[in-house]
């Protein structure tokens, strides 16, 4: 039996921030789990890490070069992630492992959600500006 | 819960070898880390290498590198430490770490999890 996982097929972040949602076809209320988000169509980079539990407080890991937060709801973990770089525009997939209470769960893999990093165009200011009027 | 049993400290002469074992036991996710930290007399803890489950991700301190060697036995959910070129500053105590993050992290904070400790003593 397999968790089901729905994402946005696309999210754009204009002021390198996103949220991105990962709902589940399942309930995480008073479950041990851990919730990963995966950079690459091999998945082969984690960049965070969601773990929680019945008793402690969510714990939330980034790897170096992301700024990574979590929020949980009944069915969905959210990753907000910041100061995302255009360099790390590609397709993320969120993936769920529940350990307890038994039996061990994961997911099916999803179809992904491609973060499109919008560069911040400033107006550069002009160089040689026009002659002033008297 | 997680319990981790370090073994394999000891004394050792400058430029001598020892080999750090570390046994993790209890639920475990498919992807995690496991790494080694040390704490010097009157020292913070400081990073000394961490691979990650998956074995595609090693991280070492500069002052280790070329000296010690992480791997880890997935089978028997052990890492390993070997250190060779062995100097009187790698003195400490040796502390192994678990993360649920998927790599191979130096950040204290990270690790949910420490042994008790194993002492390495490196004296002429």
């Known amino acids: 039996n397999k968790i089901l996982v729905k994402q946005s097929p696309m999210l754009v972040a204009y002021d390198n921030a996103v949220n991105l949602s990962c709902k589940y076809s399942y309930n995480l209320f008073s479950r041990e789990f851990r919730a990963s988000l995966h950079k690459g169509l091999d998945s082969a980079v984690e960049v965070c890490v969601v773990y929680g539990n019945y008793s402690q407080q969510l714990q939330v890991y980034s790897k170096t070069g992301f700024n990574c937060d979590g929020k949980l709801g009944n069915e969905s973990v959210t990753f907000y992630l910041q100061n995302l770089y255009v360099n790390q525009t590609d397709i993320y997939f969120c993936k769920i492992e529940v350990m307890y209470p038994p039996p061990y769960l994961d997911n099916e893999k999803s179809n992904g959600t491609i973060i499109h990093v919008k560069g911040k165009h400033l107006c550069p200011s002009p160089l040689f500006p026009g002659p002033s009027k008297p | 819960e997680v319990q981790l049993v370090e073994s394999g400290g000891g004394e050792v002469q400058p430029g001598g070898s020892l080999r750090l074992s570390c046994a993790a036991s209890?639920?475990?996710?498919?992807?995690?880390?496991m790494g080694w930290f040390r704490q010097a007399p009157g020292k913070e803890r400081e990073f000394v290498a961490a691979i990650n489950y998956r074995r595609d991700d090693a991280d070492y301190a500069e002052s280790v590198k070329d000296r010690f060697t992480i791997s880890r036995d997935n089978a028997k959910n052990t890492v390993y430490l070997q250190m060779s070129s062995l100097r009187a500053e790698d003195t400490a105590i040796y502390y192994c770490?678990?993360?649920?993050?998927?790599?191979?992290?130096?950040?204290?904070?990270?690790?949910?999890?420490w042994g008790q400790g194993t002492l390495v003593t490196v004296k002429p």
């Open positions: 209890g639920r475990m996710f498919s992807n995690y880390a």
């Open positions: 770490g678990f993360t649920y993050a998927g790599w191979a992290s130096s950040r204290r904070d990270d690790y949910n999890y």
